[in-house]
């Protein structure tokens, strides 16, 4: 492990779409690939006014933009399908929007899934 | 190095079977998803099937469900596609391609290619 | 079935050019888009993954950028060895779903 990296060995797995992909809906997933690799776990979900719908979690495979995010957090503006990913053990169980606006204070809507 | 050797096309009359084999090497082949991807000649990419890591999930284009079956043996490091009742519009090169999970398929080493021709 | 739309489906350019193809997927699909080269006679080669990560032993004169339905590469200064088919693939959902490609000829 490198000094100041959260290692990434498994996530939360989340397929609503399980049936149509043959997967499990709901689990948890080992985090494989190469060495030289960073992984990250991720969430994607929708807000149907104002439900929260979630589409898939699971491992994410080496993407700067998850580096050293210890949190799972969305911070594109009003996105149709949210995403985030973070680093370290099953860290996609909670995700949160956060919203990057430049001219209002951001307000954090934390989400803890509760996966039908 | 990651290798992926593909063999086993060749021509074959519309009804026949074919079986594909992509031998692995290179990389610990029991932890990544494959998939078969084909390309008819001058044509662009299709997908035809894909297998996670340990051959719990399958799943299959429409155009080739029910008559082709993906498979892998871990023990052999070898991935496999049985193709039956071919027709004339399976004629491609076949491609076996590695990716690191079941849902986040980007297809990160591809193999040379195995070209079948379905013709009579 | 998620279909992506590649433009334009061929361009000529010169070495040292900018050149920029894009792709349009029929329904949102995050940042969960690749690209992939495809000289002839050779098999298809990853390049970019998730969007705007760059694939393993690839030039950082390529770029990729965009999320949930318009998706763009960029080649910052062309090259004699990238002259060749680009495609765009969707990984958000079965069944994996390519663009047609899009041939970068030399001008």
């Known amino acids: 492990a490198i000094l100041g990296r959260s290692e990434t060995q498994e996530c939360l797995f989340f397929n609503a779409n399980w049936e149509k992909d043959r997967t499990n809906q709901t689990g948890v997933e080992p985090c494989y690939g190469d060495k030289d690799k960073r992984r990250h776990c991720f969430a994607t979900w929708k807000n149907i006014s104002g439900s929260i719908e979630i589409v898939k979690q699971g491992c994410w495979l080496d993407d700067i933009n998850c580096y050293d995010r210890t949190d799972c957090v969305e911070k594109k503006d009003s996105p149709e399908v949210y995403f985030c990913c973070c680093e370290g053990n099953m860290c996609n169980e909670k995700f949160s929007y956060f919203p990057e606006m430049e001219v209002t204070q951001p307000t954090s809507n934390p989400v803890t899934p509760k996966p039908p | 190095e990651v290798q992926l050797l593909e063999s086993g096309g060749g021509l074959v009359q519309p009804g026949g079977s074919l079986r594909l084999s992509c031998a692995a090497s290179g990389f610990t082949f029991s932890s990544y998803s494959m998939n078969w991807v084909r390309q008819a000649p001058g044509k662009g990419l299709e997908w035809v099937s894909g297998i996670n890591y340990n051959g719990g999930y399958k799943s299959y284009a429409d155009s080739v469900k029910g008559r082709f079956t993906i498979s892998r043996d871990n023990s052999k490091n070898t991935l496999y596609l049985q193709m039956n009742s071919l027709r004339a519009e399976d004629t491609a090169v076949y491609y076996c391609?590695?990716?690191?999970?079941?849902?986040?398929?980007?297809?990160?080493?591809w193999g040379q290619g195995t070209l079948v021709t379905v013709s009579s | 079935d998620i279909q992506m739309t590649q433009s334009p489906s061929s361009l000529s350019a010169s070495v040292g050019d900018r050149v920029t193809i894009t792709c349009r997927a029929s329904q949102s699909i995050v940042r969960y888009l690749n690209w992939y080269q495809q000289k002839p006679g050779k098999a298809p080669k990853l390049v970019i993954y998730?969007?705007?990560s760059l694939a393993s032993g690839v030039p950082s004169r390529f770029s990729g950028s965009g999320s949930g339905t318009d998706f763009t590469l960029t080649i910052s200064s062309l090259q004699p060895e990238d002259f060749a088919t680009y495609y765009c693939?969707?990984?958000?959902?079965?069944?994996?779903?390519f663009g047609g490609g899009t041939k970068v000829e030399i001008k």
């Open positions: 391609a590695r990716s690191a999970t079941w849902h986040d398929t980007h297809l990160d080493y």
């Open positions: 998730a969007a705007t």
């Open positions: 693939q969707q990984s958000y959902e079965l069944p994996l779903t």
